[in-house]
Amino acid sequence: GDTRPRFLWQPKRECHFFNGTERVRFLDRYFYNQEESVRFDSDVGEFRAVTELGRPDAEYWNSQKDILEQARAAVDTYCRHNYGVVESFTVQRRVQPKVTVYPSKTQPLQHHNLLVCSVSGFYPGSIEVRWFLNGQEEKAGMVSTGLIQNGDWTFQTLVMLETVPRSGEVYTCQVEHPSVTSPLTVEWRARSESAQSKMLSGVGGFVLGLLFLGAGLFIYFRNQKGHSGLQPTGFLS
Amino acid sequence: IKEEHVIIQAEFYLNPDQSGEFMFDFDGDEIFHVDMAKKETVWRLEEFGRFASFEAQGALANIAVDKANLEIMTKRSNYTPITNVPPEVTVLTNSPVELREPNVLICFIDKFTPPVVNVTWLRNGKPVTTGVSETVFLPREDHLFRKFHYLPFLPSTEDVYDCRVEHWGLDEPLLKHWEFDAPSPLPETTENVVCALGLTVGLVGIIIGTIFIIKGVRKSNAAERRGPL
């Protein structure tokens, strides 16, 4: 492979916004390799050497009127200006999350399981995910992947609930996000749809069988009684 | 008080590769970068270009200054080179996986420097290039880098995928595997027994009941026919 030594220069101009643009902090930072050498901090008002390597730059830039003036004005001319340019499609961007619930392991009822609430494709990243069991919030046994940035202006997160599902229980994943006015909810019932249909089929079949058997026996025995007694007199035609 | 938002103009210049980058970052997401070869602004999402504009020439001027500054700093540091920091790699999907439902595999390459990586997608061990996309090098708060690579795919139980990453900080290429984890159905024993028994009993009941009904009806019919002439 290519084993030549590498040398990296990394300038970063950072604008930190608090309460919209009410308070703004501007940082003009310079990194040689991975080490910051010199920076301008609007809270300080002049360039400062971070390491000895940056001392000549701090001294020179502080002496340069244009450079210093520009850095000092940057909270307005650069930060607030750029915020105004991008605000509509960044600060105000809203994408609704897609919520799905599924068990992570295919376990029978009354066995330990992890219920997964998958929340995906949302923006911005601020989100609140809660689990409810039969309407009561579950605070213990929650595990989360944390916020995952997809790199395409969407986020995802998985919030798992450790539980032992019992028949008839209703689990609800509730999601609060700036893109929606009221919370999104997705339910999961402790018995699966296939299990439920199997139970219904079994019980339904059993009941139907009993009905048929009962009806058959009733008709059969009613007619059986008629054989031992007198036959009714036929009507004359 | 924690800040609400951060906008970063991040640049770098790397020698001897002579590679440079200029990008704007909003809360960790790329707004745009400048394609140095094409000398044009590339918006991360196409619609961003409808709301704003950026003169790519300004970025090229910055990169020229960065190149000059790197040479000064390299000399000043007595040619101290960067220490390679190997990446951490994670493969995940864009959304929950469903068979034959289009999805996207994401290869997240994180916490590395210098900003040079070679990334390959493998399907069943063979390189895939169709539909793949990637981000530029994204800045981190610790001044290392992040990068995303994407592969659109159709989930199936037959295919396995790998994201193969090469970096000077790694002794050998790093492979991160992904395959479809088909959920095995629940062993619904109780339900199966109830269903089987219920249907069996039901079927038997229906058959026997039907026989009794038929016999009962026949008997009643026969008795009617035996009335006075």
Epitope: V24, S42, G45, N62, S63, Q64, K65, D66, L68, E69, Q70, R72, A73, V75, D76 | -
Partner: antibody
Framework: QVQLQHSGPGLVKPSQTLSLTCAIS??????????WNWIRQSPSRGLEWLGR?????????DYAVSVKSRIVINPDTSKNQFSLQLNSVTPEDTAVYYC??????????????????????WGQGTTVTVSS | AIQLTQSPSSLSASVGDRVTITCRAS??????LAWYQQKPGKAPKLLIY???SLESGVPSRFSGSGSGTDFTLTISSLQPEDFATYYC?????????FGGGTKVEIK
Amino acid sequence: QVQLQHSGPGLVKPSQTLSLTCAISGDSVSSNSASWNWIRQSPSRGLEWLGRTYYRSKWYNDYAVSVKSRIVINPDTSKNQFSLQLNSVTPEDTAVYYCARENFYGSETCHKKYYCYGMDVWGQGTTVTVSS
Amino acid sequence: AIQLTQSPSSLSASVGDRVTITCRASQGISSALAWYQQKPGKAPKLLIYDASSLESGVPSRFSGSGSGTDFTLTISSLQPEDFATYYCQQFNSFPLTFGGGTKVEIK
């Protein structure tokens, strides 16, 4: 029309503090396109810039290295004025002291990309003698 | 600190003459230079900023030129009210510095 009006004693004893104020009319000390300077003139030194104060979202001060250890320039927004304090004076500090507005001309009138400058408004000057 | 050297230190001229004053900087200052006129007992008055931009209200007979280290103030046709001392000042770097002055006297 912008005007600057000086006030302060004309005689200061050595080792004491020289204090001058400059009242602004027709502009604001918090202006976003100006800085407020103190300059002195003496036969031996000629015109000498001492320092300045100005506002750009916060207050900034810049001082000449020759006086940095003993100078303070303060803005007073309530009175729309700014002051000069020069500590530990010596006869060498005897001079005519001027306050002046440095105008930040917009990039459209300058050769360069950002600003260009000129001391476009001056006070009438105050003669300060340091003597016991 | 950047030194500004003005030449000549004094000159004698007549009304209607074309007068040229030079200012040399000890290092490059781009176009960050201003010219002032000062009359005895008065404060300096701004004539030119950014090396060649004429301050509003200043007669057009005054002009400035130059960039880097060499600058010139020209009075195309000297008027009686122009007899004064002229100073250059640099705005490139701190501390801000002035030239030693050029006294324009009546011949």
